[in-house]
Interface confidence: low
């Protein structure tokens, strides 16, 4: 009901954990020397650590990561015609996260 | 087995849909005139549209949004002692998404 909109619920902290994020597959991951092609798909889902910790001296960091190769299509444009090739991109998924102390930044001298 | 890691599965497109994201509650959302306080929690989960579309002329955009008020704690520091107050922040959740045409930028003349 509309009435339920009126109650401001207590805000819950977004805890430090893995969440699904979108990762854009940039062309330079496939081929740094040539930009005359397209990549399909242009983006994929990855698991990444996010959220916040109890104080500003700690940050949500991955404690375990896994590399995951995926196959994409590299669509080269040659004389205005598409040529379909395959390429492999390695994605990084975060498997576990932890609030870890951040090393204090050195003062700029 | 380790051998299974060598197989590159076909990459699946991260479709345009709502996903859980982390939203940082900045102090200026609570009080623009005074910075001498902390906010708890520092971040919350929101639903946001993300993902990619079939071509670069369309973008994943929210078609329906909802404002959601939540109550946070404003911890003011007065004479080095914390004073706990309540404040309300309005979060915006995306409820539905669509790949929408991006208006072409006019050429710079």
């Amino acid at each position: 009901s509309l009435g339920s909109l009126t109650v401001a619920e207590p805000a819950m902290i977004a805890e430090c954990k893995t969440r699904t994020e979108v990762f854009e597959i940039s062309r330079r991951l496939i081929d740094r020397t040539n930009a005359n092609f397209l990549v399909w798909p242009p983006c994929v889902e990855v698991q990444r650590c996010s959220g916040c910790c109890n104080n500003r001296n700690v940050q949500c960091r991955p404690t375990q990561v896994q590399l995951r190769p995926v196959q994409v299509r590299k669509i080269e444009i040659v004389r205005k015609k598409p040529i379909f090739k395959k390429a492999t991109v390695t994605l990084e998924d975060h498997l576990a996260c932890k609030c870890e102390t951040v090393a204090a930044a050195r003062p700029v001298t | 087995s380790l051998g299974s890691l060598t197989v590159a599965e076909p990459a699946m497109i991260a479709e345009c849909k709502t996903r859980t994201e982390v939203f940082e509650i900045s102090r200026r959302l609570i009080d623009r005139t005074n910075a001498n306080f902390l906010v708890w929690p520092p971040c919350v989960e929101v639903q946001r549209c993300s993902g990619c579309c079939n071509n670069r002329n369309v973008q994943c955009r929210p078609t329906q949004v909802q404002l959601r008020p939540v109550q946070v704690r404003k911890i003011e520091i007065v004479r080095k002692k914390p004073i706990f107050k309540k404040a309300t922040v309005t979060l915006e959740d995306h409820l539905a998404c669509k790949c929408e045409t991006v208006a072409a930028a006019r050429p710079v003349t």
Epitope: - | R61, L67, T88, V89
Partner: antibody, heavy 120, light 107 residues
Framework: EVQLVESGGGLVQPGGSLRLSCAAS????????MSWVRQAPGKGLEWVST????????SYADSVKGRFTISRDNSKNTLYLQMNSLRAEDTAVYSC?????????????WGQGTLVTVSS | DIQMTQSPSSLSASVGDRVTITCRAS??????LNWYQQKPGKAPKLLIY???SLQSGVPSRFSGSGSGTDFTLTISSLQPEDFATYYC?????????FGGGTKVEIK
């Protein structure tokens, strides 16, 4: 000093199109949500549309949804309102307004407005 | 949509008078209520946000109160420059809506 200057208004026939611009200065444009609000002659204020700081989120009044498009170019400090399929009831002074913090739907600063007249 | 109803639609008052304008929301909007002042031919100016917070630079004779559905704008001692039209606006949920306005005229 915050300054918002609208342009692009004028006389247009029903069914026609106009593109309004709002040039912003005196504040960090890319950090603020922006809105369009209109006022028909002798009438009250009516919210038209709001766009987020990065341009990724937009919201529209039902009366303009599907006909008007709000957009922004943060590199030019400019807000736009593309108005299509204009109707006589769209006749109003259109003002852009700076909409406060990231989730503030209020209007801190306003431009003087630009008059849009829809008539045959 | 949330309807905002302002009363009165107009009033006549003298310099020095205490003026009260009310705004009622069709459903609870917590404290998401803002007040604006508009003079003829000029852009509106934000006076009060979040029901009772005075916008920077606004004279302290202006005050706001209320929460839920009923809100009040009070001018403690009307000054010549205060003759204008006043609008309330809810910023609780889109579509954002304004009250119909209250015109404060010289008696």
């Amino acid at each position: 000093e915050v300054q918002l200057v609208e342009s692009g208004g004028g006389l247009v026939q029903p069914g026609g199109s106009l593109r309004l611009s709002c040039a912003a200065s005196g504040f960090t444009f890319s950090s603020y949500w922006m809105s369009w609000v209109r006022q028909a002659p002798g009438k009250g204020l009516e919210w038209v549309s709001t766009i987020s700081d990065g341009g990724g989120t937009t919201s529209y009044a039902d009366s303009v949804k599907g006909r008007f498009t709000i957009s922004r170019d943060n590199s030019k400090n400019t807000l736009y309102l593309q108005m299509n399929s204009l109707r006589a009831e769209d006749t109003a002074v259109y003002s852009c307004a700076e909409s406060g913090g990231a989730t503030d739907y209020l209007f801190d600063y306003w431009g003087q407005g630009t008059l849009v007249t829809v008539s045959s | 949509d949330i309807q905002m109803t302002q009363s009165p639609s107009s009033l006549s008052a003298s310099v020095g008078d205490r003026v009260t304008i009310t705004c009622r929301a069709s459903q609870s909007i917590s404290s998401y209520l803002n007040w604006y002042q508009q003079k003829p031919g000029k852009a509106p100016k934000l006076l009060i946000y979040a029901a009772s917070s005075l916008q920077s630079g606004v004279p302290s004779r202006f005050s706001g109160s209320g929460s839920g559905t009923d809100f009040t704008l009070t001018i403690s001692s009307l000054q010549p420059e205060d003759f204008a039209t006043y609008y309330c606006q809810q910023s609780y949920i889109t579509p954002l809506t304004f009250g119909g306005g209250t015109k404060v005229e010289i008696k």
